[in-house]
């Protein structure tokens, strides 16, 4: 799978994580920080 950094318009897309662009899948993906989940790493879990 080809990946690259997200475009600058997606700054802030991932609330608590790193935004990755999955080129072949034509979509952005959030790699969440430890303790966060959700499509955009918006949920905190204990």
């Amino acid at each position: 799978v080809s990946i690259t950094k997200c475009n600058s318009d997606m700054n802030g897309y991932c609330l608590h994580g790193q935004c990755i662009y999955l080129v072949d899948m034509s979509q952005n993906y959030c790699r969440c920080e430890v303790g966060y989940t959700g499509v955009r790493c918006e949920h905190f879990y204990l």
């Epitope: 690259t4 318009d9 034509s26 952005n28 499509v39 955009r40």
Partner: antibody, heavy 116, light 106 residues
């Protein structure tokens, strides 16, 4: 499957406002950005602005600043585009477009006609 | 705002010809360019995103290339069903469409 269903065609008088809705099904708009694009008859595509429904953050093309308002109601999974002070040049098909989780998935378009 | 200058605005070519459309951005868009095909009365159809990634179901005669500010879209062998208007879109910093290229059969 994923869908963006827009409201029906509108006819408006010059100076009036129009509000076009875009209802999502099959996905949560909070996971995406919703863009708005328009196309006047026989003309090209023109990006108007977008909303991040989760953060309620909006960005607009400079030429539309102050005349366009993009909103989202996450409880009904619907985005809206309101354009005020309508003039004849605003006659166009208006499209909502999902981006983010999937690249550029388009609604069917809404024709807005501005005529006296 | 980033400006996208698309050329030519229209072209006429024969079936089987190689067709090339260019888009020039006013600043580096880091390969974040997409190409759309639009036929009369239809919504635009995404063909290519991230400069050269073909969407599922799109024929391999369509291709894209480029980097920095200069990008190219190519139809290697024009077919009658390719008659349409083609648009580039930069999506690096907000969004801007090119002015479109109307492709006709000679």
């Amino acid at each position: 499957q994923d869908q963006l269903v827009q409201s029906g065609a509108e006819v408006k008088k010059p100076g009036a406002s129009v509000k076009v809705s875009c209802k999502a099904s099959g996905f949560n708009i909070k996971d995406t950005y919703i863009q708005w694009v328009r196309q006047a008859p026989g003309q090209g595509l023109e990006w108007m602005g977008r909303i991040d429904p989760l953060r309620r953050n909006t960005k607009y093309r400079e030429k539309f600043e102050g005349r366009v308002t993009i909103t989202a109601d996450t409880s009904t999974n619907t985005a809206y585009m309101e354009l005020s002070s309508l003039r004849s040049e605003d006659t166009a098909v208006y499209y909502c477009v999902r981006s983010g989780t999937r690249f550029d998935f388009w609604g069917q378009g809404t024709l807005v006609t501005v005529s006296s | 705002d980033i400006q996208m200058t698309q050329s030519p605005s229209s072209l006429s070519a024969s079936v089987g010809d190689r067709v090339t459309i260019t888009c020039k951005a006013s600043q580096d868009i880091h390969k974040y360019i997409a190409w759309y095909q639009q036929k009369p009365g239809q919504a635009p159809r995404l063909l290519i995103q991230y400069t050269s990634t073909l969407q599922p179901g799109v024929p391999s005669r369509f291709s894209g290339s480029g980097s920095g500010t200069d990008y190219t879209f190519t139809i290697s062998s024009l077919q009658p069903e390719d008659i349409a208007t083609y648009y580039c879109l930069q999506y690096d910093n907000l969004r801007t469409f090119g002015g479109g290229t109307k492709v006709e059969i000679k």
